[in-house]
């Protein structure tokens, strides 16, 4: 009486279940009279000896590939053995690797948490995920796990983290890189510095005074506002750095306190006030400006 091991499916994919059934085609006896045991490469599987002729392996992995058979034992202790069946577990290569960011869009505030999430649309088994910084990649981290996504965390984003990133996934069929993702670290403006430039040491009425306002830190573009005694004189945008300037043609009324404000949409900062005083001399002497 020959035992038959039925494997379903016969060519399983990693991560999927496999059903093993021990059949006795030449015996009509009730299965209840037998104890069954399933083996792989000389090792008993599952519960060992059992009255059930079926065994389900919930998740098959590449390393579960091997030679399987079953045995049946009668009440009289006679042991029947099936032929060996070779089960080869098929690994699905990784495909469609993508890199996403949290927060989405690759824009993060300085000091905030940035997560780079590497995903594969398909792929089974242990997948090795690698994260790289720069188009010529500096390897940041490597993780191996049995999942379709993995995360790399930058707990506190800094200006130096603004770069291109990509990830690579690999499960034995060669590395597969994601596309590039660009990270922008958004930096609130620092307190701007207001500088006053006059054409001469003692400026006179009619001279053009240059007010220059610059925030040394902050993501661009930065919009600068210029104030005289809290009244807006005008504004100027600096798309890429170097601050902004405002030209003022001097009149006697221009004495007083000047300030500027920098705003890049992430918060506004006001400069310290600069006091400009005119002394109005008598006679033919000109009005002079001192600060």
């Amino acid at each position: 009486a020959g035992l038959l091991l039925i494997v379903s499916p016969s060519h399983p994919t990693e991560g999927s279940p496999v059903n093993l059934t021990c059949k006795m085609p030449s015996l009509q006896s009730s299965d209840a009279q037998f104890q069954f045991c399933f083996f792989r490469d000389d090792q008993a599987l599952g519960p060992g000896w059992s009255s059930s002729p079926k065994l389900q392996i919930a998740n098959m992995w590449k390393e579960d590939s091997g030679s399987y058979w079953c045995e049946a034992q009668t009440m009289a202790s006679k042991v029947l053995r099936s032929w060996r069946s070779q089960i080869n577990v098929h690994r699905v290569p990784v495909a469609d690797v993508s890199l996403e960011t949290q927060p989405p869009g690759g824009q993060v505030m300085e000091g905030d948490r940035l997560v780079l999430i590497c995903s594969v649309a398909m792929g089974t088994g242990d997948i090795t995920f690698l994260w790289y910084k720069g188009a010529i990649g500096l390897n940041l981290q490597t993780k191996t796990q049995r999942s379709l996504t993995a995360e790399y965390e930058i707990p506190t984003a800094r200006e130096s983290d603004a770069e291109q990133y990509y990830c690579v996934a690999e499960n034995g069929y060669g590395p597969r890189p994601s596309g590039l993702v660009s990270i922008t670290v958004r930096i609130p403006v620092s307190r701007p510095i207001l500088m006053v430039r006059a054409p001469r040491a003692q400026a006179v009425v009619g001279d053009v005074l240059k007010l220059h306002c610059e925030a040394l830190r902050g993501s661009h573009p930065i919009l600068y506002w210029f104030y005289h005694e809290d009244v807006i004189l005008g504004s100027s945008s600096a798309p890429s750095g170097g601050g902004a300037s405002f030209n003022l043609s001097l009149t006697a009324e221009h004495s007083g306190n000047y300030s500027c404000e920098a705003n890049n949409g992430l918060g506004a900062q006001r400069s310290e006030e600069v006091t400009l005083n005119f002394t109005v001399p008598t006679g033919a002497r000109s009005n002079h400006l001192t600060s």
């Epitope: 690759g106 188009a135 010529i136 390897n139 890189p177 590039l180 660009s182």
Partner: antibody
Framework: QVQLQQSGPELVKPGASVRISCKAS????????IHWVKQRPGQGLEWIGW????????KYNEKFKGKTTLTADKSSSTAYMQLSSLTSEDSAVYFC????????????WGQGTTLTLSS | DVLMTQTPLSLPVSLGDQVSISCRSG???????????LEWYLQKPGQSPKLLIY???NRFSGVPDRFSGSGSGTDFTLRISRVEAEDLGVYYC?????????FGGGTKLEIK
């Protein structure tokens, strides 16, 4: 299949500007950097710089700064290179090329755009 | 800039010959990440360059195994074991380790 289709030959006068285009197809345009390479008649190859179409970020060879401006339009999957204040030194064939990160090589090239200066 | 010097400038060959092209860099082209970004390209007349070898010795897919690359530090070599008619053209080495990236001056492979 991946293709980089460049604009046709240009005949321009010294001092003028010109814009060469490189239209990408067959892949996700924002996933790879586009590089530009110059080849003077009968001479070797010079790397000009690259642009990342995802955000317009650029990296230039210092030699070409001020001469060259690289831009990209995501909606049409097209990269552009503008050359300004043209002189006879700018007469060349210009190539765009896609560079694959991780493996690090230029795997696809445009067919080249010939720029000729004529007074 | 890293100067890439190719020798010889011209290489007259007979079909079936084994040939070597040398490329020397003015400084080491090992990147700070440990990789050496040295590539070889072949350009035929009127065409754009085509990749042969990347990272010193890796053959690009579809490139015949008669092409091989070797070297380290500053000295690199491209070998063709048996030259075929389709191999004729100008060969360029390229370094992508240090900005600005630079090409060698080229080696013209031609029939004797």
């Amino acid at each position: 299949q991946v293709q980089l289709q460049q604009s046709g030959p240009e005949l321009v006068k010294p001092g003028a500007s010109v814009r060469i285009s490189c239209k990408a197809s067959g892949y996700t345009f924002t996933s790879y950097n586009i590089h530009w390479v110059k080849q003077r008649p009968g001479q070797g190859l010079e790397w000009i710089g690259w642009i990342y179409p995802g955000d317009g970020n650029t990296k230039y060879n210092e030699k070409f700064k001020g001469k060259t401006t690289l831009t990209a339009d995501k909606s049409s999957s097209t990269a552009y290179m503008q050359l300004s204040s043209l002189t006879s030194e700018d007469s060349a064939v210009y190539f765009c090329a896609r560079r694959i990160h991780y493996f690090d090589y230029f795997d696809y090239w445009g067919q080249g755009t010939t720029l000729t200066l004529s007074s | 800039d890293v100067l890439m010097t190719q020798t010889p400038l011209s290489l007259p060959v007979s079909l079936g010959d084994q040939v070597s092209i040398s490329c020397r860099s003015g400084q080491t082209i090992v990147h700070s990440n440990g990789n050496t970004y040295l590539e070889w390209y072949l350009q035929k007349p009127g065409q754009s360059p085509k990749l042969l070898i990347y990272k010193v010795s890796n053959r690009f897919s579809g490139v015949p195994d008669r092409f091989s690359g070797s070297g380290s530090g500053t000295d690199f070599t491209l070998r063709i074991s048996r030259v075929e008619a389709e191999d004729l053209g100008v060969y360029y080495c390229f370094q992508g380790s240090h900005v600005p990236w630079t090409f060698g001056g080229g080696t013209k492979l031609e029939i004797k």
